[in-house]
C-alpha cells in the first residue's frame, strides 16, 4: 500500500505523464498554412498538462516518446468539395529549433473531409510541433470535428 | 527491486490502468442510432478491465484522462455505396449523466467505407459512452474491422 | 523522492514499457502481400524498445494489452488510381505462430489513398505481427506518410 | 407509415411498351432505393432493378438485356419501371418496393402490384 | 448470379405442429458478420410480406412463432406451431450482392 500513498503524494509531472489536447483556435493569414490551437479547461474539455502553447503551437517541455494524434475536418465539405480543391494536405512536424526540422505526420484529403492518424515519435524539450494545412478549404473548428494532441508514452 | 515486487502485489487496479476494447454486438432498433457493444475474452480479442458495459454502452469506473478510439466500417460497402447513403455519420459522445452530454469525436464516411479516430479527453466515473451511427447502412460486425476502445492515461 | 529515484534505477524494460515505431523497408516478392519494416535510429525517427524485427516483421517480446497502430499511403495515388484499383485492402493480424493466427485489423482504401487506425488488443511474447497489402499499387516509403507502430498498455 | 401505391392494370400488344408507376408516402423518397419485383402467374419472385433517387443512378438485372428503364422523380415521391419489346412472357404483377430503415436489398415496404397482361 | 433453392417445394403440416423450410445459396451469403438471407410469406392476391431479415431478425408485428436460422449457405425458416393463417407461400432471398434472388418458393399448406 506503500507504493501507491508514494504515487500519490509525489506530483504527477514527475512521473512524466505529459499530455496536451487540443481545439483550433484559428487559421493563420494567406501565407501562413499553419493552424494555431488553444486548450484549457474554460474552453470545453481541451487542456496542456505539461507542454505549453507558444503562439498557438504547441512546445514540449519533456523528452520522451510522444503518441501524436490528429484529426482534421474540412468546413461545409462534400466529397465533390474535397475533389475539386485536392490537393488539400496537413503536415504535422517539429518546426522549431529549426535544426530538428522535420515532416512527422501528412495526409491528403482526396475525397474525404475528414484525416485522422497518430504516431508515435521521439521528441525532445523545447520542440514546437506545427500542423500546416494546405489547401484553399478551412478547417471545422468544432471540437468534436477538430483537435491535436500529445501524450507522453516512455523516456 | 523491490518496487518491482510491490508493483507486482498492487492490484493494477490500484495503478488506473483502466482499459477497454469492445467489438459490435447489434445495432439499435430503428429510431435508436446507437451501436451496442460488447467485449469479454469469450467473445474473441475484446475485453473489459476497468469499465463495464450497460446495456451495450460503455460505462466509465475512474475519473482521468482516456484516450478513445474507434473503428467502424459499413457493411457491403462501396465508395459509390457510401456516397450516395451521405450523410452516414459516426459520433462518440458522453450520452449520460445528462448534465456532461457532449459530443466528443465525430466522422463523415463521405466516399469511403472506414472511419477510424482516436482522441484524448477528460471523463469521469459514471460517464457513459454513446457511439451513435447516422444513416441507412449497417455497420460492419467483423472484428478486425468494427472495434471502440478507451485507455486511461493520466488522472 | 524514494520512489522516482527507484524508478529511473530499475530499467525501463522491467516497467513493461515496450514501444516500437517502424518505417516502410521494402514490399514483398509478388505472391508475398507482406510489408516488410525497418527500425533504429540510424534510419530517422523509428525505433524498438522491446519488440524486435524478424525478417522485416514485428516480434513481441512481452506479454500484455498493446495499442497498435498503422498509417499506409499509397504511392503515386489520386482517388482515381484508388477507386480504379479497388479493392486495395491493408490487414494487420499475428502470422505466427500458426495457432494464435488473426486478423486484429483491416481497412480498404476505397476512394482515399491513405488508411489510418489503431487498436488495443492483447498481444503475447513470441506474437509475430504481419502487415498485408493486398493490390496492385505500392505503398510510400516515406517515413511521415507509412508508418507502424506499437506501444505496450498493461499486463 | 410509409406507403407504396402503384399505377392500374394494363393490357398491351407484344413489342410494345409499358410504363408503371409508384408513388411513395409517408417516409424520405430519396434515402432509399426503390426496387422492382415481378412475378408471373403462378411462379415466382424475380428482381428486375433498382433505382437511388437521391441522384438517380440505377442497377439493372441482366437478364432484362436492356429492356427495362427505371426513373424517378423527387418532386412527386414518385418512381418509374418501364419495360420495352414486350412479350408474352412478361405478362406478370409488377411491384415496386423498399426497405423500411437499412438501404439493403430486403423489402419491407411493397406496392399493391400492377398487373401487365401482353397478348395480341 | 447466386441460385436460391428451397427445399421441399411443398409442405403439409397439422394445426399446432412445427413447420420447417430450408434455403440453400449456391454460395455463402454472409459477408461483415450478417447473414444477408430474408424471408418472406405471401398470401393469394397480395404481395410478399417481410417476416425475417438478416436470417434472424423478425420483422416488426410478426408474430414470434416465426424464427429464422442459419449461415453461410444453408438456412431454415421455422414456424413452431402452425396456425390457419399461416397457410400461404414462404419464399427466401438473399441481398448478399447484385442482382438480389429469390428462392422458387415453398408452399405450405394444412395437414
Known amino acids: 500500500q506503500r507504493f501507491a500513498q508514494a504515487q500519490q503524494q509525489l506530483p504527477l509531472e514527475s512521473l512524466g505523464w505529459d499530455v496536451a489536447e487540443l481545439q483550433l483556435n484559428h487559421t493563420g493569414p494567406q501565407q501562413d498554412p499553419r493552424l494555431y490551437w488553444q486548450g484549457g479547461p474554460a474552453l470545453g474539455r481541451s487542456f496542456l498538462h505539461g507542454p505549453e502553447l507558444d503562439k498557438g503551437q504547441l512546445r514540449i517541455h519533456r523528452d520522451g516518446i510522444y503518441m501524436v494524434h490528429i484529426q482534421v475536418t474540412l468546413a461545409i465539405c462534400s466529397s465533390t468539395t474535397a475533389s475539386r480543391h485536392h490537393p488539400t494536405t496537413l503536415a504535422v512536424g517539429i518546426c522549431s529549433p529549426a535544426s530538428r526540422s522535420i515532416s512527422l505526420l501528412r495526409l491528403s484529403f482526396h475525397q474525404g473531409c475528414t484525416i485522422a492518424s497518430q504516431r508515435l515519435t521521439p521528441l525532445a524539450r523545447g520542440d514546437t510541433l506545427c500542423t500546416n494545412l494546405t489547401g484553399t478549404l478551412l478547417p471545422s473548428r468544432n471540437t468534436d470535428e477538430t483537435f491535436f494532441g500529445v501524450q507522453w508514452v516512455r523516456p | 527491486q523491490r518496487f518491482a515486487q510491490a508493483q507486482q502485489q498492487l492490484p493494477l487496479e490500484s495503478l488506473g490502468w483502466d482499459v477497454a476494447e469492445l467489438q459490435l454486438n447489434h445495432t439499435g432498433p430503428q429510431q435508436d442510432p446507437r451501436l451496442y457493444w460488447q467485449g469479454g475474452p469469450a467473445l474473441g480479442r475484446s475485453f473489459l478491465h476497468g469499465p463495464e458495459l450497460d446495456k451495450g454502452q460503455l460505462r466509465i469506473h475512474r475519473d482521468g484522462i482516456y484516450m478513445v478510439h474507434i473503428q467502424v466500417t459499413l457493411a457491403i460497402c462501396s465508395s459509390t455505396t457510401a456516397s450516395r447513403h451521405h450523410p452516414t455519420t459516426l459520433a462518440v459522445g458522453i450520452c449520460s449523466p445528462a448534465s456532461r452530454s457532449i459530443s466528443l469525436l465525430r466522422l463523415s464516411f463521405h466516399q469511403g467505407c472506414t472511419i477510424a479516430s482516436q482522441r484524448l479527453t477528460p471523463l469521469a466515473r459514471g460517464d457513459t459512452l454513446c457511439t451513435n451511427l447516422t444513416g441507412t447502412l449497417l455497420p460492419s460486425r467483423n472484428t478486425d474491422e468494427t472495434f471502440f476502445g478507451v485507455q486511461w492515461v493520466r488522472p | 523522492q524514494r520512489f522516482a529515484q527507484a524508478q529511473q534505477q530499475l530499467p525501463l524494460e522491467s516497467l513493461g514499457w515496450d514501444v516500437a515505431e517502424l518505417q516502410l523497408n521494402h514490399t514483398g516478392p509478388q505472391q508475398d502481400p507482406r510489408l516488410y519494416w525497418q527500425g533504429g535510429p540510424a534510419l530517422g525517427r523509428s525505433f524498438l524498445h522491446g519488440p524486435e524485427l524478424d525478417k522485416g516483421q514485428l516480434r513481441i517480446h512481452r506479454d500484455g494489452i498493446y495499442m497498435v497502430h498503422i498509417q499506409v499511403t499509397l504511392a503515386i495515388c489520386s482517388s482515381t488510381t484508388a477507386s480504379r484499383h479497388h479493392p486495395t485492402t491493408l490487414a494487420v493480424g499475428i502470422c505466427s505462430p500458426a495457432s494464435r493466427s488473426i486478423s486484429l485489423l483491416r481497412l480498404s482504401f476505397h476512394q482515399g489513398c491513405t488508411i489510418a487506425s489503431q487498436r488495443l488488443t492483447p498481444l503475447a511474447r513470441g506474437d509475430t505481427l504481419c502487415t498485408n497489402l493486398t493490390g496492385t499499387l505500392l505503398p510510400s516509403r516515406n517515413t511521415d506518410e507509412t508508418f507502424f507502430g506499437v506501444q505496450w498498455v498493461r499486463p | 407509415e410509409v406507403q407504396l401505391v402503384q399505377s392500374g392494370a394494363e393490357v398491351k400488344k407484344p413489342g410494345s411498351s409499358v410504363k408503371v408507376s409508384c408513388k411513395a408516402s409517408?417516409?424520405?423518397?430519396?434515402?432509399?432505393?426503390m426496387h422492382w419485383v415481378r412475378q408471373a402467374p403462378g411462379q415466382g419472385l424475380e428482381w428486375m432493378g433498382a433505382?437511388?433517387?437521391?441522384?438517380?443512378?440505377?442497377s439493372y438485372n441482366q437478364n432484362f438485356k436492356g429492356r427495362v428503364t427505371i426513373t424517378a422523380d423527387k418532386s412527386t415521391s414518385t418512381a418509374y419501371m418501364e419495360l420495352s419489346s414486350l412479350r408474352s412472357e412478361d405478362t406478370a404483377v409488377y411491384y415496386c418496393?423498399?426497405?423500411?430503415?437499412?438501404?439493403?436489398?430486403?423489402?419491407?415496404?411493397w406496392g399493391q402490384g400492377t398487373l401487365v397482361t401482353v397478348s395480341s | 448470379d447466386i441460385v436460391m433453392t428451397q427445399s421441399p417445394d411443398s409442405l403439409a403440416v397439422s394445426l399446432g405442429e412445427r413447420a420447417t423450410i430450408n434455403c440453400r445459396a449456391s454460395?455463402?451469403?454472409?459477408?461483415?458478420?450478417?447473414?444477408?438471407m430474408h424471408w418472406y410469406q405471401q398470401k393469394p392476391g397480395q404481395p410478399p410480406k417481410l417476416l425475417i431479415y438478416?436470417?434472424?431478425n423478425l420483422e416488426s408485428g410478426v408474430p414470434d412463432r416465426f424464427s429464422g436460422s442459419g449461415s453461410g449457405t444453408d438456412f431454415t425458416l421455422t414456424i413452431s406451431s402452425l396456425q390457419a393463417e399461416d397457410v400461404a407461400v414462404y419464399y427466401c432471398?438473399?441481398?448478399?450482392?447484385?442482382?438480389?434472388?429469390f428462392g422458387q418458393g415453398t408452399k405450405l399448406e394444412i395437414k
Open positions: 432471398q438473399h441481398s448478399r450482392e447484385f442482382p438480389p434472388t
Open positions: 433505382i437511388f433517387p437521391g441522384n438517380g443512378e440505377t
Open positions: 409517408g417516409g424520405t423518397f430519396s434515402r432509399y432505393n
Open positions: 438478416l436470417a434472424s
Open positions: 454460395k455463402s451469403v454472409s459477408s461483415s458478420g450478417y447473414s444477408f
Open positions: 418496393a423498399r426497405n423500411s430503415y437499412y438501404d439493403y436489398a430486403w423489402f419491407t415496404y
